[in-house]
């Protein structure tokens, strides 16, 4: 069965959009009007992985770019990065674990838990224009809830 994907944008629960900040980083900030075109479009691929009640394993690539969000240890801390891949081989059904996120979708709110580092989530800061990162706390200051907007292919 081939990999199924959808194109989407993500906004955090404060309605901050995600945009590129340099070649290998995303940041979150409020956008309006024509500036909305700056937001990154993700290609969310549904991949094989551990399924539980409300978790769906996904990989988050940047549409038409050979970049995927991945989770690695840096200085002994789980860290979110954008990683370059060979576009001939990605996306694939069996993504390496660092690329896999457990998408948890409840009442149209989404969380993305790292499959590599359980209980670490794609997060944004309350502050404007700060990097998107991997956070180890939920329900605190940092934002782990997102909404998804479908984008036609």
């Amino acid at each position: 069965a081939p990999v199924r994907s959808l194109n989407c944008t993500l906004r955090d629960s404060q309605q901050k959009s995600l945009v590129m900040s340099g070649p290998y980083e995303l940041k979150a900030l409020h956008l309006q009007g024509q500036d909305m075109e700056q937001q990154v479009v993700f290609s969310m691929s549904f991949v094989q992985g551990e399924e539980s009640n409300d978790k769906i394993p996904v990989a988050l690539g940047l549409k038409e770019k050979n970049l995927y969000l991945s989770c690695v240890l840096k200085d002994d801390k789980p860290t979110l990065q954008l990683e370059s891949v060979d576009p001939k081989n990605y996306p694939k059904k069996k993504m390496e674990k660092r690329f896999v996120f457990n998408k948890i979708e409840i009442n149209n709110k989404l969380e993305f838990e790292s499959a590599q580092f359980p209980n670490w989530y794609i997060s944004t800061s309350q502050a404007e224009n700060m990097p998107v990162f991997l956070g180890g706390t939920k329900g605190g200051q940092d934002i782990t809830d997102f909404t998804m907007q479908f984008v036609s292919s």
Partner: antibody, heavy 118, light 106 residues
Amino acid sequence: QVTLKESGPGILQPSQTLSLTCSFSGFSLSTSGMGVSWIRQPSGKGLEWLAHIYWDDDKRYNPSLKSRLTISKDTSSNQVFLKITSVDTADSATYYCARSAYYSFAYWGQGTLVSVSA
Amino acid sequence: DIVMTQSHKFMSTSVGGRVRITCKASQDVDTDVAWFQQKPGQSPKLLIYWASTRHTGVPDRFTGSGSGTDFTLTISNVQSEDLADYFCQQYSSYPTFGAGTKLELK
């Protein structure tokens, strides 16, 4: 927790249409990536995949049975349906629905027994 | 159709023993293989996916291996509750299952 439960007519006659319902809880078929399949198992035999429906209403069918099968869903009532036309005794089986985001079926219903008999 | 062949309809073992249940695909399915356990009157239960990854809660005495066309489910230190039917399944194309192997006591 995830539960699925199948219901059907129990007994029906050859040439009739079999209608099955899968009622589920613990997940939503509006969740992107989610899907539900129908799988059957004749008594004492192996398993045969029949059809799959995704959250976005994309449908997949077993090619050898495709002309007789229709899968559908009612997202708001957490139900998936399967219709099989022109049934024969060979369609007698236990029918299961199973949840899968990818075709390794992690959650199954208890099954409903269907007998086709003249 | 990708045909999954389980050559042994029955296999016998002793409690505490080790058994290897094999499955052969009619064409290359990479590692797109799952294994299920089914006890009488019950629905199948997922044990292994991706040919070798244990599903949540499955004891580590169940081990899957293989890729391409040849796959094995190994049960070590067999317990009486492991006596059941075992099915392999591929999902490289539309899903197909093996005919099953019944694990019995010697």
